[in-house]
Interface confidence: medium
C-alpha cells in the first residue's frame, strides 16, 4: 500500500538500529572512499530527519522518495568531484537516472587496503568502549569493499561479530577465542559477497525472468513438498527483494525480506517441515536461517517426470498454450526431484528441454522427435559430475594450497593476459572449493562445487569487464550465466599469447617475505608461479614443480640465515639463473 512518507514507513518497520545500519551500508556502498566519520554524520542526519517524518508525515520533504533523499545527501558532500571525479556528474541528473548513475559507478575492486583485523587486546578495548561505533566501522569497511553485499545479511554478520566479541573479550586468552570464530564469520561473509554479486550480475545482465528461473529451481530443491504456485510466490518475492538490494533500495529490501520470513513462518504447512527451528529466532537470524535451510524430504510417490513432459500426447499443445507455465512446471518438477544437482545444471537442462520442444513441435512427428529428450540430458549431467570427481581427487591428493596452485597454472594458461593479482585471487578462491565442498557427502558435492565455482567465475568476469584483456574470457563472460562455468572449463592453453619477457625483478625477493603471515607468503609464491607461467605458458608440470620447489627452499633457507638480506641478495640471482635454465 502507498504511504505518505516512505522514509517514516521504513523507519517504523525496521526500527532505529537496523535503519541506521542499512543507511550506513547504503552510503558506504555508493561512496566507497569516504571515511567512516563522514558517513556516520550523514547517517545521523538521515535518521533525525526520518524521526521528524515519523512524528509528522506531512512535514516538509517527508513525501520524497528515499532515492531522492539519499541522493540529495550524497550530492551535498563537499569536494565530491575532487574525491570521486565523474561520479559527481550523476548529481546533475534527476531521479531515477541519478540513482542508476550512482549504481554504474560502484567499484567492484576499489583501491582500498585489505581490511586488517586489529590485535585481539586492542579490538576488545575499542569494542568495550563503544560497541555501536565498533560495529559501525565493521559495516562500513565491509560495505565499501563489497558494494553489492546483501545488506540485511551484512547486518546479520555484524550481529555475529558482536556475539563473538561479547563472548571472547571476557576470556583470559582473547586471541585464542577470537581468531577461529572471526575467521569463520569472515569466510562465510566472503562467500556471501561473491554469491550476492552473482545474483546482482544475473539481474543486471539478464533481467528478472532469468533470476526468477534461478529462484524457482533453488526453492523447488529446498521445498519439494510445496506446490508450484507456492514455489513461484516465494521465487517472485525473492526476486523482488534481490532486485531492491541490487538496485540500492536497501531499506525496502530488508523490510521485504523480513516480511517474506514472516510469511514463510506463517505458512510452514504448505512450504516445508523443516522451518520451525528458524521461525523461533529473532528477525535477522530467522531470515538467515531460512536462507540456509536444509532440504525437506522428497515426497515418496512422485511419478516419473516423463509422464507429463514426454509421454503425454498433448506436450506441444500444452507448451504452445502456456509456455512459461509449462516450462516453469518442468523446472519445478525436475528440481524437486534433484537436490543433488546444481541450480546451474538444472537451468541448463530446462534450456535444453525448451530448445527441444521449439525444434520438435514444428516438425511432422513431434513425439518421435522429443521422445529421447531425457536421454539427451545425460551428457549434460555427466560433464559436471566428472568435473567434481577429477577436481576433488586432485584436491585430496594435493591439499588446498597445492590445489590452488594447480588451478592457478590452469587458469593462467587459459587467460595469460589477465592481471596476475586477479588470476591469483580467482585461483585462491576457486581452489577453496575443495575444502568447502569435497568433504561433503556425495549427494551434496555437485551443487556445492558448481554453484560456488559459478559465483567465483562471475567475480572474475566482473573484474575483467572493467579492463577487458582476454578475448576468451570476454567470450565466456558474455554468454549465458549458466554456461559460464562449462565455458571456462573447456578453455585450453591460449595459443595466441606471446610469452612475457623474463624480468629478473619479478622473481627478486627480500627479507621482508620472512615476516609475512602464511597467507601473504602463499600469495607471494603464487604471484611468482603465475608470472612463471606467463613467461613459459607451455612449461610442463614437472618443470614448474622443480622451479617452485627450488623457490620454496630458497625462501626457507634465507629466512633461517643469520644475515637474511645478504642471503636474498646473493642467492636470489642464482635462483633466477637456475629457474631460467630449468624452463629453457
Amino acid at each position: 500500500e502507498a504511504h505518505k512518507s516512505e522514509i517514516a514507513h521504513r523507519f517504523k518497520d525496521l526500527g532505529e538500529q537496523h535503519f541506521k545500519g542499512l543507511v550506513l551500508i547504503a552510503f558506504s556502498q555508493y561512496l566507497q572512499k569516504c571515511p567512516y566519520e563522514e558517513h556516520i554524520k550523514l547517517v545521523q542526519e538521515v535518521t533525525d530527519f526520518a524521526k521528524t517524518c515519523v512524528a509528522d508525515e506531512n512535514a516538509e520533504n517527508c513525501d520524497k522518495s528515499i532515492h531522492t533523499l539519499f541522493g540529495d545527501k550524497l550530492c551535498a558532500i563537499p569536494k565530491l568531484r575532487d574525491n570521486y571525479g565523474e561520479l559527481a556528474d550523476c548529481c546533475a541528473k534527476q531521479e531515477p537516472e541519478r540513482n542508476e548513475c550512482f549504481l554504474q559507478h560502484k567499484d567492484d575492486n576499489p583501491n582500498l587496503p585489505p581490511f586488517q583485523r586489529p590485535e585481539a587486546e586492542a579490538m576488545c578495548t575499542s569494542f568495550q568502549e563503544n560497541p555501536t561505533s565498533f560495529l559501525g566501522h565493521y559495516l562500513h569497511e565491509v560495505a565499501r569493499r563489497h558494494p553489492y553485499f546483501y545488506a540485511p545479511e551484512l547486518l546479520y554478520y555484524a550481529e555475529k561479530y558482536n556475539e563473538v566479541l561479547t563472548q571472547c573479550c571476557t576470556e583470559s586468552d582473547k586471541a585464542a577465542c577470537l581468531t577461529p570464530k572471526l575467521d569463520a564469520v569472515k569466510e562465510k561473509a566472503l562467500v556471501a559477497a561473491v554469491r550476492q554479486r552473482m545474483k546482482c550480475s544475473s539481474m543486471q545482465r539478464f533481467g528478472e525472468r532469468a533470476f526468477k528461473a534461478w529462484a524457482v529451481a533453488r526453492m523447488s530443491q529446498r521445498f519439494p513438498n510445496a506446490e508450484f504456485a507456492e514455489i513461484t510466490k516465494l521465487a517472485t518475492d525473492v526476486t523482488k527483494i534481490n532486485k531492491e538490494c541490487c538496485h540500492g533500495d536497501l531499506l525496502e529490501c530488508a523490510d521485504d525480506r523480513a516480511e517474506l520470513a514472516k510469511y514463510m513462518c506463517e505458512n510452514q504447512a504448505t512450504i516445508s517441515s523443516k522451518l520451525q527451528a528458524c521461525c523461533d529466532k529473532p528477525v535477522l537470524q530467522k531470515s538467515q536461517c531460512l536462507a540456509e535451510i536444509e532440504h525437506d524430504n522428497i515426497p515418496a510417490d512422485l511419478p516419473s517426470i516423463a509422464a507429463d513432459f514426454v509421454e503425454d500426447k498433448e506436450v506441444c499443445k500444452n507448451y504452445a498454450e502456456a509456455k512459461d507455465v509449462f516450462l516453469g512446471t518442468f523446472l519445478y518438477e525436475y528440481s524437486r526431484r534433484h537436490p543433488d544437482y546444481s541450480v546451474s545444471l538444472l537451468l541448463r537442462l530446462a534450456k535444453k528441454y525448451e530448445a527441444t520442444l521449439e525444434k520438435c513441435c514444428a516438425e511432422g512427428d513431434p513425439p518421435a522427435c522429443y521422445g529421447t529428450v531425457l536421454a539427451e540430458f545425460q551428457p549434460l549431467v555427466e560433464e559436471p559430475k566428472n568435473l567434481v570427481k577429477t577436481n576433488c581427487e586432485l584436491y585430496e591428493k594435493l591439499g588446498e594450497y597445492g590445489f590452488q596452485n594447480a588451478v592457478l597454472v590452469r587458469y593462467t594458461q587459459k587467460a595469460p593476459q589477465v592481471s596476475t593479482p586477479t588470476l591469483v585471487e580467482a585461483a585462491r578462491n576457486l581452489g577453496r572449493v575443495g575444502t568447502k565442498c569435497c568433504t561433503l557427502p556425495e549427494a551434496q558435492r555437485l551443487p556445492c562445487v558448481e554453484d560456488y565455482l559459478s559465483a567465483i567465475l562471475n567475480r572474475l568476469c566482473v573484474l575483467h569487464e572493467k579492463t577487458p584483456v582476454s578475448e576468451k574470457v570476454t567470450k565466456c563472460c558474455s554468454g549465458s550465466l549458466v554456461e559460464r562455468r562449462p565455458c571456462f572449463s573447456a578453455l585450453t592453453v591460449d595459443e595466441t599469447y606471446v610469452p612475457k619477457e623474463f624480468k629478473a625483478e619479478t622473481f627478486t625477493f627480500h627479507s621482508d617475505i620472512c615476516t609475512l603471515p602464511d597467507k601473504e607468503k602463499q600469495i607471494k609464491k603464487q604471484t611468482a608461479l603465475a608470472e612463471l607461467v606467463k613467461h613459459k605458458p607451455k612449461a610442463t608440470e614437472d618443470q614448474l614443480k622443480t622451479v617452485m620447489g627450488d623457490f620454496a627452499q630458497f625462501v626457507d633457507k634465507c629466512c633461517k640465515a643469520a644475515d637474511k638480506d645478504n642471503c636474498f641478495a646473493t642467492e636470489g640471482p642464482n635462483l633466477v639463473a637456475r629457474s631460467k635454465e630449468a624452463l629453457a
Epitope: N225, T270, D308, A322, V325
Partner: nanobody, 116 residues
Framework: QVQLVESGGGLVQPGGSLRLSCAGP????????MGWYRQAPGKERELVAF???????NYNDAVQGRFTISRDNAKNTVYLQMNSLRAEDTAVYYC??????????WGQGTLVTVSS
C-alpha cells in the same frame, strides 16, 4: 491460456447425487491447487472446495460432509462428487486453477439444477 473443461452437470432431485468432472493438462492438475467454485443466480461466485497436489482438501462449510473433491492423475481429471443435494446447491459450477505467471484459468462452467 490454459484450457479447463467441466462436465457432469444436469437436473437432479433434492437428496440426489451428481459427479462433476474437470479435465485439463496433466502437468497443471498435478502441480497446482485445483478448485471448484459456484455461482447461483444473482449471487457472488463462491469457493466450494479445493484440492492441493499433496491431496490435502478443503471445503466450504455449506457442503462439508456432502461433497467430496478428488483427482485422478492418470486421467488428468479433478472430480466433485455431490451427494444429498439441496435446492440451494443450484448454481453454475466452475473448475479453477491459478497457474503462476498467468491469469486465473476458469472452465466454461456446468449448470447444476436441484429441483423436484
Amino acid at each position: 491460456q490454459v484450457q479447463l473443461v467441466e462436465s457432469g452437470g444436469g437436473l437432479v432431485q433434492p437428496g440426489g447425487s451428481l459427479r462433476l468432472s474437470c479435465a485439463g493438462p496433466g502437468f497443471l492438475l498435478r502441480s497446482n491447487t485445483m478448485g471448484w467454485y459456484r455461482q447461483a443466480p444473482g449471487k457472488e461466485r463462491e469457493l466450494v472446495a479445493f484440492i492441493r497436489p499433496s491431496g490435502l482438501t478443503n471445503y466450504n462449510d455449506a457442503v462439508q460432509g456432502r461433497f467430496t473433491i478428488s483427482r485422478d492423475n492418470a486421467k488428468n481429471t479433478v472430480y466433485l462428487q455431490m451427494n444429498s443435494l439441496r435446492a440451494e446447491d443450484t448454481a453454475v459450477y466452475y473448475c479453477h486453477t491459478r497457474p503462476p505467471f498467468q491469469r486465473d484459468s476458469w472452465g466454461q462452467g456446468t449448470l447444476v439444477t436441484v429441483s423436484s
